[in-house]
Interface confidence: low
């Protein structure tokens, strides 16, 4: 018997209140299908209904979480229906408050090295899910470690390649409601560095400036980078600018830091728009020193 293929678009992890499209494809080309839910709370809008091509389900509530299968119409079968499809697990997010997601030692990971993703919460989640943006495969299911202050899980990821880099979020769930997930953690961009040659970093008017004076950091390379990223040691964020082709054939970005009050070590990286999470080696560090007191401080 022809077994149809059930899929969910844009994915199986759906925020409460959003919609998800369930599509049932028959290899024999029959486009009428029925849907059934195997577990969790019943979804009355599925019963005794025939769908054509796809079914837009929503606004989604925790009741919609669970395992779905479809059967396609099949005139040559004794029952008139195919065998059940593959299972699709719909997980509904936003039921519990969001956990936190961190990367150790940090979100910039050298090619070939390993990073530990740590998801933690003050809620006692027995399960965590780790999800990468833009990936339709099921999220990674991880067993949480419970403790008095809540729960956490550590996931070791590597060796690092562009295939593992991307924007990650984690979710928590409790054992008796495995498909009802927390709100997503804040997104965490995991970047693989060291894929291309390092750019150069310089300071105008120079790396030593008076407090309150304007300084501009220039990152450049002969490499055809679209984007440059500037980071300051011990700071999590980074500044991002589009590269501009200079007369001398280099691609450059100028980062105006404005009136500076504190020094620090700066580095820049180059990357391509086509592979946003794959960066070059870092430039040599540029120490910016601030001397004296500004009159307007």
């Amino acid at each position: 018997q022809d077994k149809p293929f059930l899929s969910a678009w844009p994915g199986t992890v759906v925020s409460e209140g959003q919609h998800v499209t369930l599509q049932c494809r028959s290899r024999l080309g029959f486009n009428e299908f029925s849907l059934s839910k195997e577990d969790g709370m019943p979804v009355p809008e599925l019963y005794n209904r025939i769908f054509r091509n796809s079914f837009l389900m929503g606004p989604v509530t925790p009741a919609h979480a669970g395992t779905y299968r479809c059967c396609s119409s099949h005139p040559h079968s004794p029952t008139g229906w195919s065998a059940p499809s593959n299972p699709v697990v719909i997980m509904v997010t936003g039921v519990h408050r969001k956990p936190s997601l961190l990367a150790h030692p940090g979100p910039l990971v050298k090619s070939g090295e390993t990073v530990i993703l740590q998801c933690w919460s003050d809620v006692r989640f027995e399960r965590f899910l780790l999800h990468r943006e833009g990936i339709t495969e099921d999220p990674l299911r991880l067993v949480g470690q419970l403790h008095d202050a809540g729960s956490q899980v550590n996931y070791s990821m590597g060796p690092m390649t562009p295939a593992l880099a991307g924007t990650y979020r984690c979710f928590g769930s409790v054992t008796h409601l495995p498909y009802e997930l927390s709100a997503p953690s804040d997104p965490l961009d995991i970047v693989v560095v060291g894929l291309y040659g390092k750019p150069s970093l310089s300071a105008q008017p120079g790396p030593t400036v008076q407090a309150g004076e304007n300084v501009t950091l220039s990152c450049s390379s002969r490499s055809l980078f679209d984007i440059y990223h500037l980071s300051r040691e011990a700071e999590a964020g980074e500044l991002r600018l589009t590269a501009v082709l200079r007369v001398n054939g280099t691609f450059q970005a100028n980062f105006p830091l404005g009136p500076v009050t504190h020094g620090g070590n700066y580095r820049c990286f180059g990357s391509f728009r086509a592979l946003p999470h794959a960066w070059s080696d870092p430039s040599d560090p540029l120490p910016v020193s601030v001397t004296g007191n500004s009159r307007n401080l």
């Epitope: 390649t161 391509f272 592979l275």
Partner: antibody
């Protein structure tokens, strides 16, 4: 001008060893990841190994793991491929290539390795 | 491992023609694909990097396109010096893998 010059090829008996070298000039060698790629007679290109600029990251294709070792000497601007337990299927022209801008942008002229009795 | 399939082993063309060489990845490699040309007795030369970026000095009759799993190298107005072997390479994940190659020859 960027130049990569391979050497060390030749005729080797099955089970024997050979060390290939790749001398780099015309660019800051220590900034760049480097690859070895080979092409066997009547076959296509096959990636063999990669080493990052500072030697902290190394990858091999499965067929050479445990037999080949990639290394580099940044002060001497030289890349190496130590090949042991050679087999007839390792017969190929071996190229070193610089990795830059998401591509192997410069290649050496190649050195021929023949594994035969 | 990611398999790069170049289904056309040989392609016959005439000078002035437009020809498209295709490469299919067994899983998504986003845009981490480069195209190489190799002539007999010579080392490979990069034509296209990151799927669609023409390398410095490569004539603009060479164009790369595609993302995900399907990639194409198009040569418009084929010249006699374009007769060579063409290979795609994915550098999305290790081990890096080349396609088996497409030999461009005259009709």
């Amino acid at each position: 001008d960027v130049q990569l010059v391979e050497s060390g090829g030749g005729l080797v008996q099955p089970g024997g060893s050979r060390k290939l070298s790749c001398a780099a000039s015309g660019f800051t060698f220590s900034y760049f990841g480097m690859h070895w790629v080979r092409r066997a007679p009547e076959k296509g290109l096959e990636w063999v190994a990669f080493i990052s600029s500072d030697s902290t990251t190394i990858y091999y294709t499965d067929t050479v793991k445990g037999r080949f070792t990639i290394s580099r000497d940044n002060p001497k601007n030289t890349l190496f491929l130590q090949m042991t337990s050679l087999r007839s299927e390792d017969t190929a022209i071996y190229y070193c290539a610089r990795f830059y801008d998401g591509a192997m942008d410069y290649w050496g002229q190649g050195t021929s390795v023949t594994v035969s009795t | 491992d990611i398999v790069m399939t170049q289904s056309q082993k040989f392609m016959s063309t005439s000078v002035g023609d437009r020809v498209s060489i295709t490469c299919k990845a067994s899983q998504s490699v986003r845009t981490a694909v480069a195209w190489y040309q190799q002539k007999p007795g010579q080392s490979p030369k990069v034509l296209i990097y990151l799927a669609s970026n023409r390398h410095t000095g490569v004539p603009d009759r060479f164009t790369g396109s595609g993302s995900g799993t399907d990639f194409t190298l198009t040569i418009s107005n084929v010249q006699s010096e374009d007769l060579a072997d063409y290979f795609c390479l994915q550098h999305w994940n290790y081990p890096l893998t080349f396609g088996a190659g497409t030999k461009l020859e005259l009709k």
